[in-house]
């Protein structure tokens, strides 16, 4: 049979997902119901590996599968009839498959830094980069991330800095390729904690009796993480700035003369039965010298006529020595200290003085 050459196809339309493209086209020849179509699909920059698809007669659409996400392809469509008589020119169309979304990403806190490290494996296929969005309340930030390669299963990471401590952030990462955007991948991540900001003031200390005092102080600001505990520290020495080293000393050490500074009382804030909001400042009032015990610290009687100053340690993380049961490990804790109070001098023991006088 004799056939006239088919005219070229036109109006090629492409719809894509990540690994497939559905193509449709038109041919306006009267004889087009007798045509089949030959499709050549070529990945950009890889002409040696073209995929060929031949349709059944009269079919003007085809789906090509096993494509690579986020990649650029060119399709050429020839109309053909009879013994392979083809249209002179193919219809041509370039298209991109949709980029693949990131499967997931992990967040890691950076110890003592208001930052998060995001980690992910590269999604399959090609990408031009990623859109990263971070938000918390009214604050938000959008940045671009560089492209990655999925070939070797490498773990990619980026650090998100200039955040706030102990704050929950919504994080979204969107893959981009060929000007297309994948469905975003989301996670909610919370930044870590650090030492609390030291308070401006110092505790208020007042004598109650010849062997006890009352220490009043305001709760520390919780902007660097929730305050987990407070330690009340007493000294009879020179009131320099306290260090974490003093947290290991107890009333017993003080009595033995091993230290002029010691921890007399420990408050675990969780025991108050409610969480403290950032702006809420709680007031604390501690009776020092009442012979109570909190963990490894004994709140022993004070010395009549002694001169005492008080200081408060606030903890966002309190760690105890594994071997010294109930004693704070200052080096492993997140702690800051108030300044020492002014000194208070205790009165003499009136009963003892009276007793002494009669003998």
């Amino acid at each position: 049979a004799q056939y006239t050459r088919p005219s070229n196809v036109s109006n090629i339309d492409v719809s894509t997902n990540t690994t497939a493209a559905t193509l449709s086209w038109q041919n306006f020849d009267d004889a087009s119901p007798t045509y089949s179509y030959c499709l050549l699909i070529e990945k950009a920059g890889n002409s040696s590996n073209a995929t060929q698809v031949v349709t059944d007669i009269g079919i003007t659409d085809a789906t090509v599968t096993e494509l690579i996400p986020g990649s650029s392809y060119t399709v050429e469509i020839f109309a053909q009839v009879g013994d392979g008589i083809k249209s002179l020119e193919p219809g041509r169309k370039s298209f991109c498959t949709d980029p693949a979304s990131m499967a997931s990403f992990d967040c890691e806190v950076v110890p003592k830094e208001p930052a998060l490290v995001l980690k992910w494996t590269c999604p399959p296929g090609a990408n031009a980069g990623f859109e990263l969005e971070v938000s918390s309340g009214a604050w938000n930030n959008a940045t671009h991330l560089e492209s990655c390669s999925s070939e070797n299963g490498t773990e990619y990471r980026t650090e998100v800095t200039y955040l706030n401590f102990s704050t929950s952030y919504n994080i979204s990462i969107t893959t981009v390729s060929c000007g297309k955007m994948a469905a975003p991948t989301r996670n909610t991540c919370t930044t870590g904690i650090t030492d609390p900001p030291p308070p401006d003031g110092s505790p208020n200390i007042t004598s109650v009796s010849h062997n006890s005092v009352k220490v009043k102080f305001s709760g520390f600001e919780a902007s660097h993480g929730p305050i987990k505990a407070y330690a009340v520290i007493l000294t009879t020495g020179e009131a320099g700035h306290p260090s974490a080293d003093v947290l290991k000393y107890t009333y017993e050490d003080f009595k033995k003369g091993a230290s002029d500074t010691y921890v007399t009382y420990l408050i675990r804030t969780e025991e108050k039965g409610r969480s403290q909001s950032l702006s809420e400042v709680l007031k604390y009032e501690i009776d020092v010298g009442n012979e109570s015990t909190t963990l490894g610290y004994y709140n022993g009687k004070l010395e009549p006529l002694g001169s005492y100053r008080a200081c408060v340690a606030g903890f966002t993380n309190i760690t105890f020595h594994p071997q010294n049961k109930g004693l704070i490990d200052g080096a492993e804790s997140y702690v800051s200290f108030s300044r020492y109070s002014d000194a208070v001098s205790l009165p003499q023991d009136v009963a003892a003085a009276h007793h002494h006088h009669h003998h």
Epitope: E131, E133, S135, N140, A142, T174, V176, G179, M181, A183
Partner: antibody, heavy 117, light 107 residues
Framework: EVKLVESGGGLVQPGGSLKLSCAAS????????MAWVRQAPTKGLEWVAY????????YYRDSVKGRFTISRDNAKSTLYLQMDSLRSEDTATYYC??????????WGQGTLVTVSS | DIQMTQTPHSLSASLGETVSIECLAS??????LAWYQQKPGKSPQLLIS???PLHDGVPSRFSGSGSGTQYSLKIRNMQPEDEGVYYC?????????FGAGTKLELK
């Protein structure tokens, strides 16, 4: 085929308000960062506002901050620009665009906003 | 804010000629540089993003190059349909900013 169609432009007096819309089709609108770009008559292009996909965070150029509000309705595949306290210098053709990785990829045909008394 | 300085302001080229348009950013923009073509009464069309990948359907006679602060658009084998105004644009930092444009005419 990606299609963006702006509407809502017109003549408005200084101090007045206008709400522009951009109807999107041919792509998954909810995945895309979107933006408004304007072009004053016979002038160059100027980015106006930008909105992210997932969390819907908005960014504005300083000259429109506090006066313009960009928003989106993913269910309707529509982008909006609410323009209040309009000034004569806001007179321009306003285009909506997709904006992956900081490049304005697909553009609408534009809608003209004229601010004049 | 990042300023984009585009040169030349205008140029005319003969059919088949090669032309170059330069764009200088006031600070490094990490290749987040796009080029657009705009014809009278039409919307801008993206040609190149990320400094050099050609957008879908853009003829291969267009090419982009550059890094850091300096970028250029090259059009080989000038065609009548290449007439228009060309803009560069940085998408690295808000506010995203455009060059003032280069008007390309056929001689």
């Amino acid at each position: 085929e990606v299609k963006l169609v702006e509407s809502g432009g017109g003549l408005v007096q200084p101090g007045g308000s206008l709400k522009l819309s951009c109807a999107a089709s041919g792509f998954t609108f909810s995945n895309y960062y979107m933006a408004w770009v304007r072009q004053a008559p016979t002038k160059g292009l100027e980015w106006v506002a930008y909105i992210t996909n997932s969390l819907g965070s908005a960014y504005y150029r300083d000259s429109v901050k506090g006066r313009f509000t960009i928003s989106r309705d993913n269910a309707k595949s529509t982008l909006y620009l609410q323009m209040d306290s309009l000034r004569s210098e806001d007179t321009a053709t306003y285009y909506c665009s997709t904006v992956p990785l900081g490049a304005f990829v697909y553009w609408g045909q534009g809608t003209l906003v004229t601010v004049s008394s | 804010d990042i300023q984009m300085t585009q040169t030349p302001h205008s140029l005319s080229a003969s059919l088949g000629e090669t032309v170059s348009i330069e764009c200088l950013a006031s600070e490094g923009i990490s290749n987040y540089l796009a080029w657009y073509q705009q014809k009278p009464g039409k919307s801008p069309q993206l040609l190149i993003s990320h400094a050099n990948p050609l957008h879908d359907g853009v003829p291969s006679r267009f090419s982009g190059s550059g890094s850091g602060t300096q970028y250029s658009l090259k059009i080989r084998n000038m065609q009548p349909e290449d007439e228009g105004v060309y803009y560069c644009q940085q998408g690295y930092k808000f506010p995203y900013s455009f060059g003032a444009g280069t008007k390309l005419e056929l001689k």
